[in-house]
């Protein structure tokens, strides 16, 4: 007896974080034997959509012409072959930005940081929110941070980083959100450029330093500040 059909692969183009009004295409790739593809959205009647496969039948396209709140959420897809339905794909979490006004991002004590010291990025919203996220441009995993630790509504969240090294340098933005829908984020904050300098005593980069002259570990750009991953936006460090 043959085992269960292998699960398909589900992804979104141009990505899984989409601004309000922009288009997104969800792809489900199965096998050449697929006869039909089905897309299910969590907390929506199943199936959310069905599509015939595109030649050579190993994938199907589900199009969203204009992103709105209704499309944000968690998706899985399946395919049907002559022997039955496949296992579900791993989930795809489609996040919409632009649901709320943009927060403000600042660096304490300053966006100019000496290697080996600390910096705290502060994300502030005009209205109380319960989730704040920090992202770094051009990172291997662009969405880097966890949910704000506090469940209570608040106007700001602090993202501590220590010790700072050159890899922390770059452009950051933050988002705010409400816990009732993890898939709806604010407009992004204006960018904040974090500039990391060497120590005053030894400005030249050096692979090995005594901490009396310089400091600062961490190849990974950022680490968690809270206890619960933000749905759809978790960085893969575990």
């Amino acid at each position: 007896q043959a085992g269960p059909l292998p699960k398909p692969t589900l992804w979104a183009e141009p990505g899984s974080v989409i601004s309000w009004g922009n288009s997104v295409t969800i792809w489900c790739q199965g096998t050449l034997e697929a006869r039909e593809y089905r897309l299910d959205k969590e907390e929506s009647p199943a199936p959310w959509d069905r599509q015939n496969p595109l030649e050579p039948k190993n994938k199907a396209r589900f199009s969203i012409p204009s992103m709105t709140e209704d499309y944000a959420g968690r998706y899985r897809c399946y395919y049907r072959s002559p022997v039955g339905w496949s296992q579900p794909s791993d989930p795809l979490e489609l996040v919409m930005t632009g649901a709320y006004s943009k927060p403000t991002l600042s660096a304490l004590p300053s966006p100019l940081v000496t290697s080996g010291k600390s910096v705290t990025l502060l994300c502030q919203s005009r209205s109380p929110m319960d989730t704040f996220l920090l992202i770094k441009e051009r990172a291997a995993h662009p969405l880097l941070h966890l949910r704000s630790e506090h469940g209570a509504q608040q106007h700001q969240a602090e993202f501590p980083m220590s010790p700072v090294t050159s890899v922390h340098g770059g452009t950051y933005r933050c988002f705010s959100s409400h816990g009732f829908s993890h898939y709806l984020l604010s407009h992004p904050s204006d960018p904040l450029e974090l500039i990391v300098s060497g120590s005053l005593e030894d400005p030249r980069p050096s692979p090995t330093r005594s901490v009396s002259t310089a400091a600062g570990p961490e190849d990974q750009p950022l680490m968690p500040t809270g206890s619960v991953p933000h749905s759809g936006l978790r960085r893969h460090w575990e």
């Epitope: 602090e158 220590s162 692979p207 400091a215 570990p217 990974q220």
Partner: antibody
Framework: EVQLVESGGGLVQPGGSRKLSCAAS????????MHWVRQAPEKGLEWVAY????????YYADTVKGRFTISRDNPKNTLFLQMTSLRSEDTAMYYC???????????WGQGTSVTVSS | DIQMTQTTSSLSASLGDRVTISCRAS??????LNWYQQKPDGTVKLLIY???RLHSGVPSRFSGSGSGTDYSLTISNLEQEDIATYFC?????????FGGGTKLEIK
Amino acid sequence: EVQLVESGGGLVQPGGSRKLSCAASGFTFSTFGMHWVRQAPEKGLEWVAYISSGSSTIYYADTVKGRFTISRDNPKNTLFLQMTSLRSEDTAMYYCARSTGTGAMDYWGQGTSVTVSS
Amino acid sequence: DIQMTQTTSSLSASLGDRVTISCRASQDISKYLNWYQQKPDGTVKLLIYYTSRLHSGVPSRFSGSGSGTDYSLTISNLEQEDIATYFCQQGNTLPWTFGGGTKLEIK
């Protein structure tokens, strides 16, 4: 479950050498910076050395600089501390610990004891 | 280097008590203050990071507060398993430094 297990401790003569190891499991070792921290008998904790996830950045406390070398083997999920020119004041329990990136060390090993004595 | 001072080296309390342990830094450490628990067998665990954030799996009876140079750890309802030595650590600037520890004992 995150686990850090140190080994390699023992009795060493003054001026001698010793290499400590820390075997990591339960997390993606290659994405975390790592520390060595030590504790002399009946004393407090003392930070010793740090290595970033990709080994590009290394730092030492002044008390061990030039004598100790921290390194790591990411494919083998192992952290090392090579100790040379050992002194009696290096006698301590040596712990490896994982760095959070927020100024803390979130998981620690059980420690390995190094005694420097003739 | 930043010096960390825990003025109380040992503390006796009764089960159920509210216990506060203090820590002072020689300069402003901008809330980069962490608390660790070391059990008699040598096991070290992170309790609180960045002054007040509870590490995952740590009971909610532990809390932290402070700013600038003065920080504290509070255990709201002391339990037998809390008997340990508590260390503060600054993560603001390398070299990271620890307080001398506060040993908590049962009355």
